[in-house]
C-alpha cells in the first residue's frame, strides 16, 4: 500500500485554483492573474475568457472558475455559454442577413429575439378566428362558427397571400 | 443528439395518397420548424412547405397547395405530411429537415434518413 | 420566380482545386444567406457552409464559402480535392424568409 501511495501522481495534490509547476518540482503553484484551474490535479491553468466587443462581464474570471460573459444591450446571447451576441430585432421582426425585417404576412414574433412564426391554424381545433393576427401577435381562436349564438360571428381573417401559401385560418 | 426519423414510404396507386411520418427527438420538437423537402430520381431538392409544430401553422409551396397537408402531434414529437391525388411525378425521396430559430433565412441543420415513395400501377 | 442556377457537372483531379458557383437571377444575392449541401448517393443532405462563409464543426477548412455581388453568385470551392469529395452540392437560399429556394445542383467528379 505504501508502495502505491509513493507511485501515485503527486501533481493529483493540487487543488483547484493551482497548478502541478513541472518546472518547480511539481510543487503546486497558484493560477497566475487572468486564468484559472476549475478542477485539481491540472499541469496548466487555463486562460480566463475577456468579455470584450458587444460581450460584457455576467461573472468576473477566478482562480477556479472562468469569467462568464453576456451581451451588451440591444444583443442577445446564442450559443452555449453565449458563444455570440445577435442582434435585437423589434417585435413583429426577425433577423436577416440585411439586419432586421418585418414578419411576412401570416407570421408573427411577439419577441425581441427569434424567428416569426405562423400564425396558429384555429380550424385545426375546430374553432374560428376570434382576433386576427399581427405581425406582433398571434391570431386569438374562439369558438366554432356552429358554437357561436345567433347574431354573434367571428371575425373573417384577411385572405391569406398567395406565394407561399399560408394555410387557412 | 438530435434526431430526425422518416417513414411511411413505399408504393403507391395514381390518384392514390399517402401519410409520411417524421419522428423527432433530441430537441424541443415545439420552437422550430420543420421543412419538408423532396427529391425526385436523378433531380434536385423540390420544397414542399413547412410547419410550426408549436401551434400547427403551415405553409405551402404553391405546386403542393391543395394537395398536401402538414400536422404534427406534439405528443408524440411526429411531424405528417399527407399528400392525395398522387400521379407518377410524385415518386421521389420525401425528406423532412429542420431549421434553426436564430435568423428568418438559415440553413437546414438536421435532415431526416428520407422515405422513398414510389407512384405506379 | 426567384431561381439559384448552378452548373450541371464539374470535374476536376485530386489535390486540385474547383469551385462551383450558384447564380441568382433576379434580386441581390446579399439579401439573404447562402447556405450549401453535400449529397452523397443514397444519402441526405448535410451542410458544408452555411450563412455564406461559415463551416459547421467537422468540415474541413479545404471548403470555403464566398458571395461575389457584382456577379449576384455565391460560390463553394474546394482546395486539396479527395476522392470522397464526390458527391452533389446544393446552394440554398430564400425568396422571403418562408420560401427556401434550391439550385439544380452540381455533380463532382474527382477524376
Known amino acids: 500500500f505504501e508502495r502505491t501511495r509513493s507511485l501515485q501522481d503527486p501533481c493529483s495534490n493540487c487543488p483547484a485554483g493551482t497548478f502541478c509547476d513541472n518546472n518547480r518540482n511539481q510543487i503546486c503553484s497558484p493560477c497566475p492573474p487572468n486564468s484559472f484551474s476549475s478542477a485539481g490535479g491540472q499541469r496548466t491553468c487555463d486562460i480566463c475568457r475577456q468579455c470584450k466587443g458587444v460581450f460584457r462581464t455576467r461573472k468576473e474570471c477566478s482562480s477556479t472558475s472562468n469569467a462568464e460573459c453576456d451581451c451588451t444591450p440591444g444583443f442577445h446571447c446564442l450559443g452555449a455559454g453565449c458563444s455570440m451576441c445577435e442582434q435585437d430585432c423589434k417585435q413583429g421582426q426577425e433577423l436577416t442577413k440585411k439586419g432586421c425585417k418585418d414578419c411576412c404576412f401570416g407570421t408573427f414574433n411577439d419577441q425581441k429575439r427569434g424567428i416569426c412564426r405562423p400564425w396558429t391554424n384555429c380550424s385545426l381545433d375546430g374553432k374560428s378566428v376570434l382576433v386576427n393576427g399581427t405581425k406582433e401577435r398571434d391570431v386569438v381562436c374562439g369558438p366554432s362558427p356552429a358554437d357561436l349564438s345567433p347574431g354573434a360571428s367571428s371575425v373573417t381573417p384577411p385572405a391569406p397571400a398567395r406565394e407561399p401559401g399560408h394555410s387557412p385560418q | 443528439e438530435v434526431q430526425l426519423v422518416e417513414s411511411g414510404g413505399g408504393l403507391v396507386q395514381p390518384g392514390g395518397s399517402l401519410r409520411l411520418s417524421c419522428a423527432a427527438s433530441?430537441?424541443?420538437?415545439?420552437?422550430?420548424?420543420i421543412y419538408w423537402v423532396r427529391q425526385a430520381p436523378g433531380k434536385g431538392l423540390e420544397w414542399i412547405g413547412n410547419i410550426w409544430p408549436g401551434n400547427g401553422g403551415t405553409f405551402y409551396g404553391e405546386k403542393f397547395m391543395g394537395r398536401a397537408t402538414f400536422s404534427a402531434d406534439t405528443s408524440k414529437n411526429t411531424a405528417y405530411l399527407q399528400m392525395n391525388s398522387l400521379r407518377a411525378e410524385d415518386t421521389a425521396v420525401y425528406y423532412c429537415a429542420r431549421r434553426p430559430d436564430y435568423s428568418g433565412d438559415d440553413y437546414f441543420d438536421y435532415w431526416g434518413q428520407g422515405t422513398l415513395v414510389t407512384v405506379s400501377s | 420566380n426567384v431561381m439559384l442556377t448552378q452548373p450541371h457537372s464539374v470535374s476536376e483531379s485530386p489535390g486540385k482545386t474547383v469551385t462551383i458557383s450558384c447564380k441568382l437571377n433576379?434580386?441581390?444575392?446579399?439579401?439573404?444567406?447562402v447556405h450549401w449541401y453535400q449529397q452523397r448517393p443514397g444519402s441526405s443532405p448535410t451542410t458544408m457552409i452555411y450563412?455564406?462563409?461559415?463551416?459547421p464543426d467537422g468540415v474541413p477548412d479545404r471548403f470555403s464559402g464566398s458571395i461575389d455581388s457584382s456577379s449576384n453568385s455565391a460560390s463553394l470551392t474546394i482546395s486539396g480535392l479527395k476522392t470522397e469529395d464526390e458527391a452533389d452540392y446544393y446552394c440554398?437560399?430564400?425568396?422571403?424568409?418562408?420560401?427556401?429556394?434550391f439550385g439544380g445542383g452540381t455533380k463532382l467528379t474527382v477524376l
Open positions: 440554398h437560399s430564400y425568396d422571403s424568409t418562408i420560401t427556401p429556394v
Open positions: 433576379s434580386g441581390n444575392i446579399g439579401s439573404y444567406y
Open positions: 450563412r455564406d462563409d461559415k463551416r
Open positions: 433530441g430537441y424541443t420538437f415545439t420552437s422550430y420548424y
